[in-house]
Amino acid sequence: DYKDDDDKFRDCAEVFKSGHTTNGIYTLTFPNSTEEIKAYCDMEAGGGGWTIIQRREDGSVDFQRTWKEYKVGFGNPSGEYWLGNEFVSQLTNQQRYVLKIHLKDWEGNEAYSLYEHFYLSSEELNYRIHLKGLTGTAGKISSISQAGNDFSTKDGDNDKCICKCSQMLTGGWWFDACGPSNLNGMYYPQRQNTNKFNGIKWYYWKGSGYSLKATTMMIRPADF
């Protein structure tokens, strides 16, 4: 856990530019406030400076959490975690950010989706997601609806389905009705990961019933 008392970093790009180029957990400061949050910084992938906002890798953390937990974040930045919608919303409304989603299946394959523009609306607007400029190897159609879906949790139903997607598919996500992805679904181990409607799904890469082995969502300023 790295922190210099004199340094205030808004994101991992600022950490990187300050000379800290080692992967690890760093203390970040909310924009326009003194509130702090711990995040994992990837200082190696694609030039470094990536703030990890989500990671799934082993099923050790329960992702069926409340609205408040998704708001403030949960889990362990060194393992499975959700950084927190409020921090990400505030950060991505300060300047233009890119979002990279890195995926691993159980057969040793990896893929990614990169969005050249990403921001989350405020809590008042249910942390609605906005995405543009899709490239990458995980599908030429976006598996997160780019329409600007609201975030939903088990106690905050903002999806476009008469059902409650978060309760049915588990996890908080930008559900449509219910849509082609959910990286916060149930973690299924190998050989139990197929034909699972409520797993970790990225439809336009692996189809509807395939639950992924590992996922990482990371953001970085577009002008890094």
């Epitope: 906005h130 899709l134 600007g148």
Partner: antibody, heavy 121, light 107 residues
Framework: DVQLQESGPGLVKPSQSLSLTCTVT?????????WNWIRQFPGNKLEWMGY???????SYNPSLKSRISITRDTSKNQFFLQLNSVTPEDTATYYC??????????????WGQGTSVTVSS | SIVMTQTPKLLLVSAGDRVTITCKAS??????VAWYQQKPGQSPKLLIY???NRYTGVPDRFTGSGYGTDFTFAISTVQAEDLAIYFC?????????FGGGTKLEIK
């Protein structure tokens, strides 16, 4: 429901400034999204002119950058277009529209009905 | 600026026909392409966004596809009320640019 309504003079003299107002109802222009001006020339060609985002930042078409200004009055939920040094080539129907992304250009889901502007002496 | 070349300029069709309109971008537009319908005397209406997503309330006879530089818009079964001009628009890079339009006329 979100509604946009353009208003302004239908006739402007060459070399003068064109000023239009877009009044938005059903959604606060400071909540989210970008608020655009688009024009359609005789013959139906469409041209994006610029936007003001919910945060107040602006983006303009480089072809107009020296002549255009988009501002807003948040208390009235209105945004404005000013186009300076107009010529007859600026004769068009002017639309205001909301785009589906707040920090960059995007598709536009709500449009006003348009207001016709003729530049002539 | 990305130039959007839209073809054809005019489509003369009968009710019940299937029609296809294409737009070619001068450079990659990812999937950031929208399609609009403009009926006579009205403002444009959004039909398709992000290349293939149907906007709320748009009938499923309207579809869009494509990625990169080549985009297609189709009406599976043309109806009389589809008489309009159809425009494509890229918003991958600023400034956003429109195709020249395709006028759909019913025989």
């Amino acid at each position: 429901d979100v509604q946009l309504q353009e208003s302004g003079p239908g006739l402007v003299k060459p070399s003068q400034s064109l000023s239009l107002t877009c009044t938005v109802t059903g959604y606060s222009i400071t909540s989210d999204y970008a608020w655009n001006w688009i024009r359609q020339f005789p013959g139906n060609k469409l041209e994006w002119m610029g936007y003001i985002s919910y945060s107040g930042s602006t983006s303009y078409n480089p072809s107009l950058k020296s002549r255009i200004s988009i501002t807003r009055d948040t208390s009235k939920n209105q945004f404005f277009l000013q186009l300076n040094s107009v010529t007859p080539e600026d004769t068009a129907t002017y639309y205001c529209a909301r785009s589906t992304f707040g920090h960059y250009v995007s598709s536009m889901d709500y449009w006003g009905q348009g207001t016709s502007v003729t530049v002539s002496s | 600026s990305i130039v959007m070349t839209q073809t054809p300029k005019l489509l003369l069709v009968s009710a019940g026909d299937r029609v296809t309109i294409t737009c070619k971008a001068s450079q990659s537009a990812s999937n950031d392409v929208a399609w609009y319908q403009q009926k006579p005397g009205q403002s444009p209406k959004l039909l398709i966004y992000y290349a293939s997503n149907r906007y709320t309330g748009v009938p499923d006879r309207f579809t869009g596809s494509g990625y990169g530089t080549d985009f297609t818009f189709a009406i599976s079964t043309v109806q009389a009320e589809d008489l309009a001009i159809y425009f494509c628009q890229q918003d991958y890079s600023s400034p956003p640019t429109f195709g020249g339009g395709t006028k759909l006329e019913i025989k």
